[in-house]
Interface confidence: medium
Amino acid sequence: MGNSCYNIVATLLLVLNFERTRSLQDPCSNCPAGTFCDNNRNQICSPCPPNSFSSAGGQRTCDICRQCKGVFRTRKECSSTSNAECDCTPGFHCLGAGCSMCEQDCKQGQELTKKGCKDCCFGTFNDQKRGICRPWTNCSLDGKSVLVNGTKERDVVCGPSPADLSPGASSVTPPAPAREPGHSPQIISFFLALTSTALLFLLFFLTLRFSVVKRGRKKLLYIFKQPFMRPVQTTQEEDGCSCRFPEEEEGGCEL
């Protein structure tokens, strides 16, 4: 026990002695952050000149501060111990490590191309001021139907499968979809309204079924089927929209 204690004390003394010797041999190691070891002045610690910094001790030079020029603006001023930090002027956002570039903002429903901001093409959307237009969700891949059509700014909203909504289905009330995070009360209200409508249609259908002539009945059945057909995903089509196809880096949209 006493032997190990002696070893620890001996090690500590060695370390302390080494540090003291090192600082005697290299006076620069004593220079704190915000200073540099000035060889021209007998290795004394001089403060960093204006517009420069040293973030660690023992440095022989200070680094020039980053300059936030042009479209960049200063987010954090340079100090003697830390570099300046830049961000972008309004209407632009940062790109790259440490905001090495600024990129122009676009409106929702647009993406930035080499020719500037362009509207998202039919079938794509962008709900942010940056980034690219992404394709609408394909509801049918999950066996669902489109509840709310997609736009340039918003993705489609998928709902229960068409089978769950058809009037001839065994269950009158469609199964409540698992609520995804971010679903608003409006969508829940929409489902409730849809259920009520389905019930009303069913009652209306049963009432008229026996009182309508054969030809008229066929026509009526056609009308009933319409609301349950998969809606066409529509959006405002504008000239100069931006289409991005896998084989093209950038393509115009000939609609």
Epitope: T61, D63, I64, C65, R66, Q67, K69, G70, V71, F72, T89, G91, F92, L95, G96, A97, G98, S100, M101, C102, E103, Q104
Partner: antibody
């Protein structure tokens, strides 16, 4: 098409003055993020940045070698950039290029064809 | 000011060769580095910006890499039209260029 065209170069005696112009077309010099710069190249030598002006025109930058002698300015109504060269020295002899700082950064994406300034007695 | 040192200052190569040019900054500059190509009597042309982003219209045989103090321009397969002088440029603090690297025909 985005283009920069320099003019105003020529032969001048040491101590003399000259005014270089750079006419921009295809883009506006007054656009917020666009900076414009002058870069020179002495015969057979490398490129040397001389001066820059920010998109708003509120900030100017100069290389130490020309500070106090050269002045950068612009006329947004004419969409033209200028460089006033005073107290010219033999070492200022070079082809002077104007170049657009890329809208989103700090590099030069559009260059003019250059104009030659010769300082000699 | 921030100094940029290019190496080599000149090199001889043949068509099809892989060519590498390096640029060293006197201090860390993040990725604030661009590369230009200049042919005799012509203005420089931007090739690479932000250390590794290829400028629109520039062939994909040109590539850039690096960050901090050490940067590289690579031409994967040298073409006849690539014989020129190449410059690096920093925009971290004001603007400075490297001294240039001349690529000549072997």
């Amino acid at each position: 098409e985005v283009q920069l065209v320099e003019s105003g170069g020529g032969l001048v005696q040491p101590g003399g003055s000259l005014r270089l112009s750079c006419a921009a077309s295809g883009f506006s010099l007054s656009t917020g993020g666009v900076g414009v710069s002058w870069i020179r190249q002495a015969p057979g030598k490398g490129l040397e940045w001389v001066s820059s002006i920010s998109g708003s025109g509120g900030t100017t930058y100069y290389a130490d070698s020309v500070k106090g002698r050269f002045t950068i300015s612009r006329d947004n109504s004419k969409n033209t950039l200028y460089l006033q060269l005073n107290s010219l020295r033999a070492e200022d002899t070079a082809v002077y290029y104007c170049a657009r700082d890329d809208l989103y950064s700090w590099y030069f994406d559009v260059w003019g064809q250059g104009t030659l300034v010769t300082v000699s007695s | 000011d921030i100094q940029l040192t290019q190496s080599p200052s000149s090199l001889s190569a043949s068509v099809g060769d892989r060519v590498t040019i390096t640029c060293r900054a006197s201090q860390g500059i993040g990725s604030s580095l661009a590369w230009y190509q200049q042919k005799p009597g012509k203005a420089p042309k931007l090739l690479i910006y932000a250390a590794s982003s290829l400028q629109s219209g520039v062939p994909s045989r040109f590539s850039g890499s690096g960050s901090g103090t050490d940067f590289t321009l690579t031409i994967s397969s040298l073409q006849p039209e690539d014989f020129a002088t190449y410059y690096c440029q920093q925009g971290y603090y004001t603007w400075t260029f490297g001294q240039g690297t001349k690529v000549e025909i072997k």
